[in-house]
Amino acid sequence: CKAMHVAQPAVVLASSRGIASFVCEYASPGKATEVRVTVLRQADSQVTEVCAATYMMGNELTFLDDSICTGTSSGNQVNLTIQGLRAMDTGLYICKVELMYPPPYYLGIGNGTQIYVIDPEPCPDSDF
């Protein structure tokens, strides 16, 4: 297993619709053809997997049908979008990149993007 540098923004504020997008960029030492991207969430010192996708270079990322993540790839960049976020989902979202094929296997883990999610204010009651 060889180390690889992964860069991601330090902080992002999700939209009022609970959508957060950020780029995860990796410094590929070679010509990988198969890449696996995993998003981990760290909160209260607990780490959980949010979503993961394996893709062939030049192809779209394919997450599971029920995943809250979508993404596109361009060269050594992966543009990740996480949807359906609520205030309770605020936390540190860490991008993990694995170059699966061809060997050697490379692993890179970013420092994480602190995603803040603000629940929208409830609309005031209106009289008609």
Epitope: A10, V11, S15, A87, D119
Partner: antibody, heavy 116, light 108 residues
């Protein structure tokens, strides 16, 4: 090294607007947020809101909602805070700061005086 | 909004003594998203602690933070002359983010 340099002191009349700038250097501007905090003379700190320089999304203190606008110009690594319909109790030192989990780097502060 | 109440309002101590500052929240602060700042007259605040217990870059280890939920503490193990200042807590787990009213640590 990380630096945040704010615009100079302002004197405004009640009802006017003020726009304070905060120029960042020494780091990747779009990777961080910019938080705005104010401090009235002899008083404590008051959080005004923040902007994610990555995507321009904002989160404002409810008491200032409708009067405050925070923006960024990523081409110049500058953040702006505009406060409208100024009142005498808006007289304060206004600080910008680089935000992730707390403000680790601060601007020098901009004194805004509202007086007729 | 979450109201943060700091106590005591003023703490009179001598250099070398231990200072214990309290910050109590009106409701639970999610994920211990609480920070502590130090401010001296005429200066911008300085971040000491984030995440309730993590020291910011360059902060001496005599400063430590602890607590979770609604009760948080900033401890200065041995006061140095430069530590006499006003200290603020801030929660950033629930919008609007809020500050406590501050605790002044003065020389006895």
């Amino acid at each position: 090294q990380v630096q945040l340099v704010q615009s100079g002191a302002e004197v405004k009349k009640p009802g006017a607007s003020v726009k304070v700038s905060c120029k960042a250097s020494g780091y990747t501007f779009t990777s961080y947020g910019i938080s705005w905090v104010r401090q009235a003379p002899g008083q404590g700190l008051e959080w005004m809101g923040w902007i994610s320089a990555y995507n321009g999304n904002t989160n404002y203190a409810q008491k200032l909602q409708g009067r405050v606008t925070m923006t960024t110009d990523t081409s110049t690594s500058t953040a702006y805070m505009e406060l409208r319909s100024l009142r005498s109790d808006d007289t304060a030192v206004y600080y910008c700061g680089r935000w992730v989990r707390g403000v680790e780097y601060w601007g020098q502060g901009t004194l805004v005086t509202v007086s007729s | 909004e979450i109201v943060l109440t700091q106590s005591p309002g003023t703490l009179s101590l001598s250099p070398g003594e231990r200072a214990t500052l309290s910050c109590r929240a009106s409701q639970s602060v999610s994920s211990s998203y609480l920070a502590w700042y130090q401010q001296k007259p005429g200066q911008a605040p300085r971040l000491l602690i984030y995440g309730a217990s993590s020291r910011a870059t360059g902060i001496p280890d005599r400063f430590s933070g602890s607590g979770s939920g609604t009760d948080f503490t900033l401890t200065i193990s041995r006061l140095e002359p430069e530590d006499f200042a006003v200290y603020y807590c801030q929660q950033y787990g629930t919008s609007p983010w809020t500050f406590g009213q501050g605790t002044k640590v003065e020389i006895k």
